[in-house]
Interface confidence: medium
């Protein structure tokens, strides 16, 4: 799901190319947004559309299943705890919810890519908004976790633990509220639009060019650059403090969170680089032509697929990097009476069974 111009004079296809496409051709235009006439038709999209048709449904279906199972397992492990969740675990629970909600929309986008949007404008708005809410939420919650760790370790300030438990909940609510705000354009401008040339209906934006560019810049800054900067800053300071204090156990405990952040950066950087290229084309800093547009469309599909993979990656990272998560997962399976799990009883039980699987009482990760 890869998700235009107010009151302009006529631009036709040749002029559009020459003027760096003030009317961007492969996107939706609001017929009531512009009282202009007869602009360039869109570039041929045969290659990118055929690529999407072949690539996206399979990828989205796989990510849907993996994301649902993985994040379901994370939520189950966290919610099975008898004690109150630590601040980081609370953020991780919200992150699992965000990732689950995001992957829940993937089957809809798979159908959209494979055939067309058959779910109507209402669901188009909801699915688009849900998708973006959880895209932003995932990034912002990771930033919250890093800031929480930063306060705990660098400043020895256990902001959420010492304060009322409501503080972490309020932070999460603020994140969700902010994400809802970011998703307002989806509720307003997304609609099921019949594409005359393709003879198919797709869930698309229907607003002016300037709005589209602004939304992309917002996505780039709020959904990627800002969270990544927060994470990089916080973890650089955390690592510096831990290295100075020679806290080997603490350094080991940081492994999970560092891997999670690196995974976020690796998964989302390619997509946002492609979005940056698209923004530069919108702004006229890069000339837009049909060849480049087609390459950008395909790159967007591939890199967004890599980005959505991040939703499924966190649970795998917890499972393979975080020992405590594995322990609690086994214990949960045992409690549920899973067969063929007798060998699990020989697993060493945690000395801090009721402490978080993501942080210790020393306010650092005990991912090992």
């Amino acid at each position: 799901m890869v998700l235009e111009v107010s009151d302009h004079q006529v631009l036709n296809d040749a002029e559009v190319a020459a003027l760096l496409e003030n009317f961007s051709s492969s996107y939706d235009y609001g017929e009531n947004e512009s009282d202009s006439c007869c602009t360039s038709p869109p570039c041929p999209q045969d290659f990118s559309l055929n690529f999407d048709r072949a690539f996206l449904p399979a990828l989205y279906s796989l990510l849907f299943l993996l994301g649902l199972l993985g994040n379901g397992a994370v939520a189950a492990v966290l919610l099975s705890r008898r004690t109150a969740l630590s601040s980081t675990d609370t953020f991780l629970l919200h992150l699992a919810v965000a990732d689950t909600l995001l992957v829940l929309t993937l089957p809809l986008w798979a159908v959209d890519a494979a055939v067309q949007w058959v779910f109507g404008s209402g669901l188009c708005k909801v699915a688009g908004a849900l998708f973006n809410i959880n895209f932003y939420a995932g990034a912002l919650l990771l930033a919250c976790i890093s800031f929480d760790r930063y306060l705990n370790i660098v400043h020895a300030t256990q902001l959420y633990r010492r304060g009322p438990p409501a503080r972490v909940t309020l932070t999460c609510l603020a994140v969700w509220g902010l994400c809802l705000l970011f998703a307002l354009p989806d509720f307003i401008f997304l609609s099921a639009h019949h594409d005359e040339r393709l003879n198919a209906t797709h869930c698309q934006y229907n607003f002016p060019q300037v709005g589209r560019t602004a939304l992309r810049v917002l996505q780039l800054v709020a959904g990627f650059l800002l969270p990544l900067l927060v994470m990089a800053y916080c973890y650089a300071h955390i690592l510096a403090v831990l290295l100075v204090s020679r806290g080997q156990r603490r350094l080991r405990a940081m492994r999970l969170v560092v891997v999670v952040v690196v995974a976020f950066a690796l998964c989302w950087t390619p997509y946002h680089l492609v979005v940056l290229v698209d923004i530069l084309m919108d702004l006229g800093a890069l000339a837009r032509n049909c060849g480049r547009e087609s390459r950008v469309d395909v790159a967007k599909s591939v890199t967004s697929g890599l980005g959505y993979m991040h939703c499924c990656l966190n649970p795998l990272l917890y499972a393979f990097v975080g020992v405590k998560f594995r322990e609690r997962m086994w214990m949960l399976l045992l409690r549920l009476g899973c067969p063929n799990q007798r060998g699990l009883q020989r697993q060493p039980s945690s000395s801090r069974r009721d402490s978080s699987w993501s942080e210790t009482s020393e306010a650092s990760y005990s991912g090992l």
Partner: antibody, heavy 123, light 106 residues
Amino acid sequence: EVQLLESGGGLVQPGGSLRLSCAASGFTFTSYAMSWVRQAPGKGLEWVATISHGGTYTYYPDSVKGRFTISRDNAKNTLYLQMNSLRAEDTAVYYCARHPIYSGNYQGYFDYWGQGTLVTVSS
Amino acid sequence: DIQLTQSPSFLSASVGDRVTITCRASSGVNYLYWYQQKPGKAPKLWIYFTSTLASGVPSRFSGSGSGNEYTLTISSLQPEDFATYYCQQFTSSPYTFGQGTKLEIK
């Protein structure tokens, strides 16, 4: 059913004026850009004028610029072409045509045409 | 202005024949549009975006091409296909039409 009905054609002397009308029905007139296209007897098609859906923008080829004025009355679902300083070479059947919308944007081709009205400029 | 030159201007063919009409542009265009016109009638949109058939156009018609050369092909000519065909571009203002190709019964 989309219908475009031209009227106002007739015989006029060179230098004279004429106003053509096109009554539209069967679609939301206010949502579409409209044009006039003409065809001289036994000749090909020539685009004459275009107006945006709200009437803000008008477009003309050099051959008629300054002499012809396209306008619309969205309340009456009517398109107009005011032709001044008419010349013999303006003799043609004048068609009113609708621009389709692709992705909410007006396209420069024509999906519906009226039956045309004949304008003869002769002394 | 972009000039569109259709060839041939006149074409005599028989029912069942495969017919190709060519439209050459004086400079490159992104898409081409075709109209069919019968005597005393208004033109009808026939093919848009180079190759997409307008509503109600039989599948024996096809459009193709890119850049400076475009073609309209009728795989098996039928009696109702005898008419004049015009190509049109709107890559560059003014929007221009070809001079037309009159398809006649041999």
